[in-house]
Amino acid sequence: LNTTVLQGMAGQSLRVSCTYDALKHWGRRKAWCRQLGEEGPCQRVVSTHGVWLLAFLKKRNGSTVIADDTLAGTVTITLKNLQAGDAGLYQCQSLRGREAEVLQKVLVEVLEDPLDDQDAGDLWVPEESSSFEGAQVEHSTSRNQETSFPPTS
């Protein structure tokens, strides 16, 4: 499974969208977890509503919010008030009982606010942009190794 690299600005929000085959994963809750080390376990950060029908409702754990559009097959995770400590490798998962199937691996990189850094160069972020979205390549602060999110394998 390819890893998608997403960059966000410290202090702002980063939105991650993981797409999946809606019918294949019908009835399954989704989760966002943080990988501990290269081969280590993935520590659950937040998961969608316990009642699958209500998965569209936002569930929050600290500064991380998750919601699932089960018809469209898109689970959205928002990391609010991004901090340097949020950088790392994460997974979107589809849950079936005790089994967690990886939908997408996401490497989150946190950029320092250029206003706080004299060496930030000419990096320009529109004033109204308070949220970065994965696959939004028009901003130089967001890039994908894999531009499309393929259906889960």
């Epitope: 085959d21 019918l23 294949k24 019908w26 009835g27 699958w52 029908l53 079936r96 009982g97 005790r98 089994e99 259906p151 889960t152 394998s153």
Partner: antibody, heavy 122, light 107 residues
Framework: EVQLVQSGAEVKKPGESLKISCKGS????????IAWVRQMPGKGLEWMGI????????RYSPSFQGQVTISADKSISTAFLKWSSLKASDTAMYFC???????????????WGQGTTVTVSS | DIQMTQSPSSLSASVGDRVTITCRAS??????LGWYQQKPGNAPKRLIY???SLPSGVPSRFSGSGSGPEFTLTISSLQPEDFATYYC?????????FGQGTKVEIT
């Protein structure tokens, strides 16, 4: 009408190979998981494994892992169950069944094939 | 694997009787449980899904209840065509597992 139609009864000798089929119609075959279930003579139902024809993602029961191969060809809306070397203990009725999709989530096995009798005897 | 313990393994009843069959899961399976009826020589038929939901076409005398480890199938008034074998199936975790079956016979 949603249907799963299985291939006919088979009589085989130990050591022979066999592939039985399950053809779906009346619905989008690639979008529903298909399970295989064994029923030995006079016994209960045993879940063997399941496949998602859309991408051939397959899960097996540990009891059947390595004993059979589950596959699917979405272009002909058909799932398959294959043995490379049959044993007398494989004598049973085999059912395919579709995992249902309900508003509240998955609905178990909602549509079943009529079953394929496999007899393995020397 | 999750074990499904079904009881009783068989029972004798008369037409009009109320019949209850129980399935107990060895661990939590939420409401990911179905009930199936099988008559000799036929494929199983789904009676209940999501522990308590009745598919269209299934008579209302069949009902399911329970959550967590214990689930129940009830036939409120047994009819001649209900004499068959009944199975529960958990589809919460792989591998899915069936109960051992309950054969309902005529007294």
């Amino acid at each position: 009408e949603v249907q799963l139609v299985q291939s006919g009864a088979e009589v085989k000798k130990p050591g022979e190979s066999l592939k039985i089929s399950c053809k779906g119609s009346g619905y989008s075959f690639p979008s529903y998981w298909i399970a295989w279930v064994r029923q030995m003579p006079g016994k209960g139902l045993e879940w063997m494994g399941i496949i998602y024809p859309g991408d051939s993602d397959t899960r097996y029961s540990p009891s059947f892992q390595g004993q059979v191969t589950i596959s699917a060809d979405k272009s002909i809306s058909t799932a398959f169950l294959k043995w490379s070397s049959l044993k007398a203990s494989d004598t049973a009725m085999y059912f395919c069944a579709r995992q249902g999709i309900e508003v509240t989530g998955t609905g178990g096995l909602d549509v079943w094939g009529q079953g394929t009798t496999v007899t393995v005897s020397s | 694997d999750i074990q499904m313990t079904q009881s009783p393994s068989s029972l004798s009843a008369s037409v009009g009787d109320r019949v209850t069959i129980t399935c107990r899961a060895s661990q939590g399976i939420r409401n990911d449980l179905g009930w199936y009826q099988q008559k000799p020589g036929n494929a199983p038929k789904r009676l209940i899904y999501a522990a308590s939901s009745l598919p269209s076409g299934v008579p209302s005398r069949f009902s399911g209840s329970g959550s967590g480890p214990e689930f129940t199938l009830t036939i409120s008034s047994l009819q001649p065509e209900d004499f068959a074998t009944y199975y529960c199936l958990q589809h919460n975790s792989y591998p899915w597992t069936f109960g051992q079956g309950t054969k309902v016979e005529i007294t």
